[in-house]
């Protein structure tokens, strides 16, 4: 028969207050016959946390029948964990001796330890919006985790980013801990739709990470193309003059005519139409009431977007009884 | 002062099946494994096996393929039943307690029923 | 399985003492039981625990164990004690008997 040892498989075993513990403990022989009893902490000031044949001890119940025959399963649980449990727990085999049975073998020990799940991340992107190209910084917090050890990832549409620096507070011995990181984020074009991910993982959280998420769509700004074009047709004397104003974010959007420079204010038709990558794209038409007589006329079409400064494309009309080809150019 | 009372049949025939019951006064029956023995005439005690309140048993391997042990809890009794036997199974059969007292290392039999002696023969 | 192995028989005369051994594969490591019985009576548990006596046995019974033997021994042996005694052990889930002693008080 092969010598006796004894298992605690788990070196760590981390436990919330008021929650059941379960310390597993087996032995790999019946021989030497002899009492496995559970000790809390070395020496002679250890503490008798379980003895089966004799003491009272109401918070702790076997995992297995002890009383059934070649039981190798000396495993227990402490109902009702308070603080005042933590420390590492020993199941120690007695051999039979006279007057009293003796030592025999210790297993390696568990030490409990009390743990606490992280909170869930809150991630913060930057106050205000940036253009594509530019870098954002993006925040993540979680608090009230034991033990210290934490692992926080970031990913930008479930690619890992690289870019940031993490802390944990505080770095000393504490009942609990937090923990805060900040990404730096480039942003791209179509980032619109793109989502920021802060994953926490924790031993407590038993391989199941918690995440937060931002969405870049609050980060980011997409200045709007323009360009201004008129229609080859001419109906009667009106000419339609179109400004598309193309792949911006967000919808925030002011849009004037200018004919010869005075501000028209007579209503425009137009559209609005949202791209895949979550931009939109705004088209404007003007009709321009044009005579043979009547000189060149200039439109200007003039963008606010979300309370930047205006953009403008102009567009010289040359009307002749042909209706000559137009031509444009901006002005910033 | 726990005590055994065991009674049942004292002759059969070959092939019979042996039926024996002991019941315990004065103390406790859960806790404890509850055990069957024998003794042939003239010859030492062979173990038969055993049964605890919840009807967890153990046999001796030589006898297991015929033998049943049965528990009642709401009597504080327990039976044995022996199939098949021949002319060797002719004994005195006790019931006995195991001491449980230090689990799990097992104890000895430290209450024994008066015995029933079985003859088998045709 | 585990055997346990004991003489026969074994005489002493009043007053002396008697040992009883019963040897089996690492009795050492397990703990031995011992059983007086005397004729037309069931068997009494005389030594539990290899060295420890019930109540109401006398001191005069002792048990020892160590290696591969075990011993009952009786000191000032009298007419009263003369009997079978038996070893007994268990052997995983089995109790083992030994074959038995007969102790004849001369």
């Known amino acids: 028969e092969e010598e006796l040892q004894m298992i605690q498989p788990e070196k760590l075993l981390l436990v919330t207050v008021g929650k059941t513990a379960t310390l597993h403990c087996t032995v790999t022989s019946l021989l030497p016959v002899g009492p496995v009893l559970w000790f809390r902490g070395v020496g002679p000031g250890r503490e008798l946390i379980y003895n089966q044949k004799e003491g009272h001890f109401p918070r702790v119940t076997t995992v297995s029948d002890l009383t059934k025959r070649n039981n190798m399963d000396f495993s227990i649980r402490i109902s009702s964990i308070t603080p005042a449990d933590v420390g590492t727990y020993y199941c120690v085999k007695f051999r039979k001796g006279s007057p009293e049975n003796v030592e025999f073998k210790s297993g390696p020990g568990t030490e409990m330890a009390l743990g606490a799940k992280p909170s869930a991340p809150v991630v913060l992107g930057p106050a205000a919006r940036t253009t594509p190209e530019h870098t954002v910084s993006f925040t993540c917090e979680s608090h009230g985790f034991s033990p210290r050890d934490i692992t926080l990832k970031w990913f930008k549409n479930g690619n890992e980013l690289s870019d940031f620096q993490t802390n944990v507070d505080p770095t000393g011995q504490s009942v609990a801990y937090s923990i805060r990181s900040t990404a730096r984020v480039v942003l791209d074009p179509w980032d619109v739709r793109s989502q920021v991910i802060c994953e926490v993982a924790h031993v407590t959280l038993q391989g199941d990470p918690l995440r937060g998420t931002a969405n870049l769509s609050e980060a980011i700004r997409v200045p709007p193309t323009l360009e201004v074009t008129q229609q080859p047709m001419r109906v009667g004397n009106q000419v339609n003059v179109t400004c598309q104003v193309r792949k911006f974010y967000p919808q925030s959007l002011q849009l004037t005519w200018s004919e010869n420079g005075n501000v028209c204010q007579r209503e425009t038709a137009s559209t609005l139409t949202e791209n895949k990558d979550g931009t939109y794209n705004w088209t404007s038409w003007f009709l321009v009431n044009i005579s043979d007589q009547r000189d060149d006329v200039v439109l200007t079409c003039q963008v606010k977007h979300d309370g930047q400064l205006a953009v403008s494309k102009r567009l010289a009309l040359e009307v002749t009884v042909h209706q000559k080809d137009q031509s444009s150019d901006a002005t910033p | 002062q726990v005590q055994l009372q065991q009674w049942g049949a004292g002759l059969l025939k070959p092939s019979e099946t042996l039926s024996l019951t002991c019941a315990v006064y004065?103390?406790?029956?859960?806790?404890?494994?509850w055990s069957w023995i024998r003794q042939p005439p003239g010859k030492g005690l062979e173990w038969i096996g055993e049964i605890n309140h919840s009807g967890s048993t153990n046999f001796n391997p030589s006898l297991k393929s015929r033998v049943t042990i049965s528990v009642d809890t709401s009597k504080n009794q327990f039976s044995l039943k022996l199939r098949s036997v021949t002319a060797a199974d002719t004994a005195v059969y006790y019931c006995?307690?195991?001491?449980?007292?230090?689990?799990?290392?097992?104890?000895?039999?430290?209450?024994w029923g008066q015995g029933t002696t079985v003859t088998v023969s045709s | 399985s585990s055997e346990l192995t004991q003489p026969p028989s074994v005489s002493v005369s009043p007053g002396q003492t008697a040992s009883i051994t019963c040897s089996g594969d690492?009795?050492?490591?397990?703990?031995v039981y011992w059983y007086q019985q005397k004729p037309g009576q069931s068997p009494v548990l005389v030594i539990y625990?290899?060295?420890r006596r019930p109540a109401g046995i006398p001191e005069r019974f002792a048990g020892s164990a160590s290696g591969n033997t075990a011993t009952l021994t009786i000191s000032g042996t009298q007419a009263m004690d003369e009997a079978d005694y038996y070893c007994?052990?268990?052997?995983?889930?089995?109790?083992?008997f030994g074959g038995g002693t007969k102790l004849t008080v001369l």
């Open positions: 690492k009795l050492g490591d397990k703990y």
């Open positions: 006995s307690r195991v001491d449980s007292g230090s689990y799990p290392y097992y104890d000895g039999l430290d209450v």
């Open positions: 004065g103390g406790s029956f859960s806790g404890y494994y």
């Open positions: 007994q052990t268990w052997d995983s889930s089995t109790v083992v």
């Open positions: 625990h290899d060295d």
